[in-house]
Amino acid sequence: CLHFYASQVPPQYPPIQSIRVQFTRCENEKGCIITSPSKDETMKVQDNSIIINCDGFYLISLKGYFSEELSLSLYYRKGRGPLFSLSKVTSVDSIGVAYLAFKDKVYFNVTTHSTSYKDIQVNGGELILIHQNPGGFCAY
């Protein structure tokens, strides 16, 4: 007769949902062209948006130095306010927590106050999302 103790059988959670994307260029009045440098990310990029599959709180980190002064917003759902918004900045180094749910998509909107440029160049552009509630509802 075999006996298993609860401590010996860890719950089989899927890997923690997380992603690190980079961006080197943004388009005025549109978004930033984001790419994931790693093939091993547990979250995916689609149409310059990060797809949310799991409900829960996410740690969000955003960094970058911009070639022009701009206003930048990070959105998660059409018709909803931004996760955060920055006005007339040349750099960003922000961290926060937000509740996101299945079917949400995280994406940028940027606008410059100059009509001289269609695109904004970015040094050190990086967006990181890390799910904080493993074991919660996920749909793939």
Partner: antibody, heavy 118, light 106 residues
């Protein structure tokens, strides 16, 4: 400390080719736009070319378009400038540059001299 | 293509203010960066985004930009400020430098 070190400058005949290199250290090379800027003897500064951190976007000055190619190897922290069909007017000190902000050149190398002459 | 116009040379008396101009069509809508280059040396960024000063650049250097003119001001010029000064902007996908101004400190 940020260091940019150019090499590859030489005396070359008109129509010839040359490849410049710039090794970078002291900052996250792969995250930064990189630039080549030149200065003809006794003249002012002239922007030549630029490349984005991931290498996906490049731009060139009209004077070098179609003749020069900028590239980078992020694994080696190295920026390159391949120069073909060189002309007398390409004679200059070539600097590689970068910075915290794109297009604000806070980091410069010491320069490498390219002389085009028959 | 976009043109930036600087006076080729400028004289200033020691410890007096110096103003170096950079003209361009509606330059006030662009971000202007300024560089100092001493003889035989690489340029040094002294002002970025019109008026911001990098770490290590003395407070006597300042910048302004509006309309068709950007201005670099040295509040009290020292002998060590004798150099060439260049303005620079991004225009579309290119970067453009002014022709440079040689500042002589008398």
């Amino acid at each position: 400390e940020v260091l940019l070190m150019e090499s590859g400058g030489d005396l070359v005949k008109p129509g010839g080719s040359l490849r410049l290199s710039c090794v970078a250290s002291g900052f996250t090379f792969s995250s930064n736009y990189m630039y080549w800027i030149r200065q003809a003897p006794g003249k002012g500064l002239q922007w030549v070319s630029q490349i984005s951190g991931d290498g996906s976007f490049t731009n060139y000055a009209d004077a070098v378009k179609g003749r020069f190619t900028i590239s980078r190897d992020n694994a080696k922290n190295t920026l390159y400038l391949q120069m073909n069909s060189l002309r007398d007017e390409d004679t200059a000190v070539f600097y590689c540059a970068s910075g915290i902000y794109p297009n604000a050149f806070g980091y410069w190398g010491q320069g490498t001299l390219v002389t085009v002459s028959s | 293509s976009y043109v930036l116009t600087q006076p080729p040379s400028k004289n200033v008396t020691l410890k007096q203010p110096a103003h170096i101009t950079c003209g361009g069509d509606n330059i006030g809508s662009k971000s202007v960066h300024w560089y100092q280059q001493k003889l035989g040396q690489a340029p040094v960024l002294i002002i970025y985004y019109d008026s911001s000063r990098p770490t290590g650049i003395p407070e006597r250097f300042s910048g302004a930009n509006s309309g068709n003119t950007a201005t670099l001001t040295i509040s009290g010029a020292l002998a060590e400020d004798e150099a060439d000064y260049y303005c620079q902007v991004r225009d579309s996908s290119a970067n453009v430098f002014g022709g440079g101004t040689h500042l002589t400190v008398l």
